[in-house]
Structure formats: C-alpha cells, structure tokens
Amino acid sequence: EEELQVIQPDKSVLVAAGETATLRCTATSLIPVGPIQWFRGAGPGRELIYNQKEGHFPRVTTVSDLTKRNNMDFSIRIGNITPADAGTYYCVKFRKGSPDDVEFKSGAGTELSVRAKPSAPVVSGPAARATPQHTVSFTCESHGFSPRDITLKWFKNGNELSDFQTNVDPVGESVSYSIHSTAKVVLTREDVHSQVICEVAHVTLQGDPLRGTANLSETIRVPPTLEVTQQPVRAENQVNVTCQVRKFYPQRLQLTWLENGNVSRTETASTVTENKDGTYNWMSWLLVNVSAHRDDVKLTCQVEHDGQPAVSKSHDLKVSAHPKEQGSNTAAENTGSNERNIY
C-alpha cells in the first residue's frame, strides 16, 4: 500500500476579520494509526492550534467527525478570526507511539491571510481658529486595517486637494496597520460653510470608501469690518450714531462705545443676521445727547471678536451747531440693536 500523504489543497486562504476560516486537510490512508495535530508555523517555535487526541481548543471545530473509524478528513474551522491569526498552518499526522506519539507526515501548509476593515476616518483640525488667507493643517487617522495597502484622498467641498502627506504605520510587518495624513488648506472668507473630507479606500470596503469630515466653521475666524455713521437727528438735542459690524464669524462678539475715550456702554452681539456665506452682521446704535457736550465728541465703536484684540472705528460728532442744554447729566442714552427703549 502507498505511504500516507497529508494533503492541504489550499496554498492560501483569505478571510475577513470576524469570520470563520476553514483550513482543509485530508490523509490518503488510514495507516499508520495516530492523531492529527494542527500547528501555526513550523520548527521548534510552532504553535499548537488543535490536537485531535487531547486539549481544549474553544475556537476550533472539526469539519467532519474525527471519531468515525474510516475518517480521512482532518479539516478544521477557526472562529472569530482576527489579524493576529495570520500565518502558515500545518496539518501534521502523528504515528501512535509509546510513550509519545511521533510526528509522521506534514502537509505543505496553508497560508491564512486576514483582511480587516479600517476604522472610520477621524478628521481633526487646528486647536485655534485662523483667519482667511492663512494655511491650516488637518489630520486624518484610521486604524486596524489589513493588508497594508490603502489609499487616502483629501477633498475640500468636493475638490481634491494635493498638498498632503500620508504615512502608514508600522513600516514593517504587523497584524494590522494605521494611516495618518496631514493636509494643508488655505482658508478663504467664504469657508464658513466649507467641509474638508478625508476619504479612505481599502480592499475590504468593496469600492465604497469611508469618509471623515471636518467643518471649516470650527476652524475659521472671519474678522468683522466696522462702519460708524451718524443718523439724522432724532430729537432736537439727540444724535443717533450706528456701528455696522459686518461679515464676522463666529458670532462671539462684544461691542463697546466710547465717548472721548470713556466707556459709555458695552454689549454682546445677540440678535444677528446671517449672510448667505455663513458670516454674520450686527448693528449697534448710540443715542447721544449733544446738549451735554460743550465741545465736539469723538465716538468710538470698539469690537472684540472671538477673544481677539479689539478693533475700533471712530466718528467725530460736531456739537457746535446744536444749542446746549444746561444742567443735563445724561451724555448718552443706552440703546442697542436689541434694546430700543429710551430711558
């Protein structure tokens, strides 16, 4: 009779993480009598995966009933595969011996490769806001994929970006890999509604890439433009001065009126109007009682936007043309865009 051969018909097997791997093995003869063992790797450092004779192997099940007298199918299934299970698996026939069974024949080995999906890309922007015309960096990270080959692209509002650097770690071998990419984006005043997208394509995703997004509204700061104008006289001794605060983002803004350098009123932007591009406009006004002033008044609208150093715009109010009302203590009426009462 021909000598027993151990046949592992599959040179390689590819399995997705979380699935079950089937490793096929058959013997060509029932003789010699003895158990089958499965190993990952060969040589003295090989790992026992399954022993037909003894031991507890909770992740391994046999394809056929090994207790049947004429069984020659020693295929196994390994459940809940992870990238750490990758390697070459050998089906090894042992010959019954005393006191120990002895290795008789090994199969040629089956290379198990594990595919694992990348995690959803996480895009993060700079810690501090930046203004238009500045270049900011965005990072994109995805982890846990295998094999190593992966493609990453950056987009801004659907337009592909070219200024980015990508690293896949580790450079050597690993059970799974991570990708890290940094893209440079130049901000414009219109970017409040813009999005930066990181797109990751991998063999496990079957042509349906994963995307991570960042809204530039979290990154951009559009500083306001100020305009101070004097409105027509509202009452005989009162002048209405407005400060138009235009095209700013984010909304966080504090406005202070100064009369000849002295603080007259401070208010916080609340009822703002939103522009199509996502920036905001706001208006504050100051009612000045000109009869309380003997000389011309320098009115200053000072705006502190999003914690930045204050910007200001001044207006010189000529009072010489107005009759002066003696004894009036009120220099200005407290009136803002959201507070119209005169008190």
């Epitope: 790797g41 060969a42 990758a86």
Partner: antibody, heavy 122, light 112 residues
C-alpha cells in the same frame, strides 16, 4: 531579494553589554526564524540563538544566561544583547534567516548578513 | 547537545576532480517524518557562509548541481563532482533537528 544588515559598536569594554541590531529589507519576517551566529577569529561557527516571528526564543545553553534576542516586526529589525562580555566574545557576529516548513526541524539558514566584527577590549 | 564531527580537516583538491567531505552526528538527525535535518554551508574567504544543502540532500536555490548531499541517520556526505576554483573555502555541516543548532568544525578546501 531579502537582505540583512548588522549594525552596532565594533568595540565593547569587558564586563559591558554587547548590543547588535539586524535590519531585514526586501522580504517578510513572518514564518521565519531570525538567528545570531558568531565566529571567533580563525575559528568555526557558533550558534547563539534565534527568535521566531511569533516571539518565541531559543538560546544556546552555553550563552543563555547572558543573551537576549528580541524582534520588532514593525520596523523590520531584530536584536542581540549579550551581557558581561569578555575577550572570549570577540568574534564576527552574523545575523541570518532560518527557514522552517517541514515539521519540527529547520530547513536551512538561507540568508546571512555580511557580519560585523566585535572586539572586546579595554 | 548534538556533536558534529567533520573530516577531513583539510582537503587539497585539483580543479575538475571530485571531492568528498564527511560529517557524523552524535545522534540520528533522521526525524520521524522522514526528513534528515542536516545542512551544508560553504564559507568562501572573507565572506559570509552560504547555504548549499538542506535536509541532507536538497540543493538550495542557485546552488550548482555539482554539489550533492547524501546520508541518513548519523552519517552524511557532501560531494563535489568536479571542483572549481570558486569552491575554495571552509565547508561546514550543521544539524538543524534540535536546539542548540551545532556546527561541525569545518573542512578547509584548497587548490593543490
């Protein structure tokens, strides 16, 4: 084409630790044993030990108490550390790849580094 | 440890002539799976060793067919059918059955 390159100091003081690194390029670390072998001047080859890709290590009993072999697959390197060196440890140190695909034995040390000379002297 | 003994220590050869080196192990290198775990290496002057034969008789990739290995159990032989000038160096046998891996003392082949 797999290549191995040893690196480390050429001179080590007696009683100090010898540290060598072998960088693997052009091939996989998986499924192989990664070995250190030395050759004293004018003498034969002596196996120091090896590490399997799964991290299992095997050492020559004559050196075991002084030797540690480690593997970092993520940077394609494996290393040898030998403590308490003496003049008897002066040798050319080779790193090498050992194949295994037929049971318990090994199937040839098929790739060798060019070797690095280590002299133990004060 | 398995002790490996090589002979001769030195072998003067004539180019074109055959040559033979013997290697004996202190215990059988024939494993129960039918493989004999013995390797042969050539170390040319100033170079690293090079694998010639593994499992007693299998020629390594790229090794000329003038090199052949034979033997089983404890007695092994490396034969060179026609020696060439580039074959000069030290030939080593090594047992690869169990750790520690052990080498023979070497056979120095030189041109007469």
């Amino acid at each position: 084409q797999v290549q191995l390159q040893e690196s480390g100091p050429g001179l080590v003081r007696p009683s100090e630790t010898l540290s060598l690194t072998c960088t693997v390029s052009g091939g996989s670390i998986r499924n192989y044993y990664w070995s250190w072998i030395r050759q004293p001047p004018g003498k034969g080859l002596e196996w120091i030990g090896f590490i399997y890709y799964n991290g299992r290590t095997f050492y020559n009993p004559s050196l075991k108490s002084r030797v540690t072999i480690s593997l970092d697959m993520s940077i394609n390197q494996f290393s040898l550390k030998m403590t308490s060196v003496t003049a008897a440890d002066t040798a050319v140190y080779y790193c090498a790849r050992v194949r295994a695909y037929s049971g318990i034995g090994l199937d040839g040390t098929d790739v060798w580094g060019q070797g690095t000379t280590v002299t133990v002297s004060s | 440890d398995i002790v490996m003994t090589q002979s001769p220590l030195s072998l003067p050869v004539t180019p074109g002539e055959p040559a033979s080196i013997s290697c004996k192990s202190s215990q059988s290198l024939l494993y129960s799976n039918g493989y004999a775990y013995l390797d042969w290496y050539l170390q040319r002057p100033g170079q690293s060793p090079q694998l010639l034969i593994y499992q007693g008789s299998n020629r390594a990739s790229g090794v000329p067919d003038r090199f052949s290995g034979s033997g089983s159990g404890t007695d092994f032989t490396l034969k060179i059918s026609r020696v060439e000038a580039e074959d000069v160096g030290v030939f080593y046998c090594m047992q690869a059955l169990q750790t520690p891996l052990t080498f023979g003392g070497g056979t120095k082949v030189e041109i007469k």
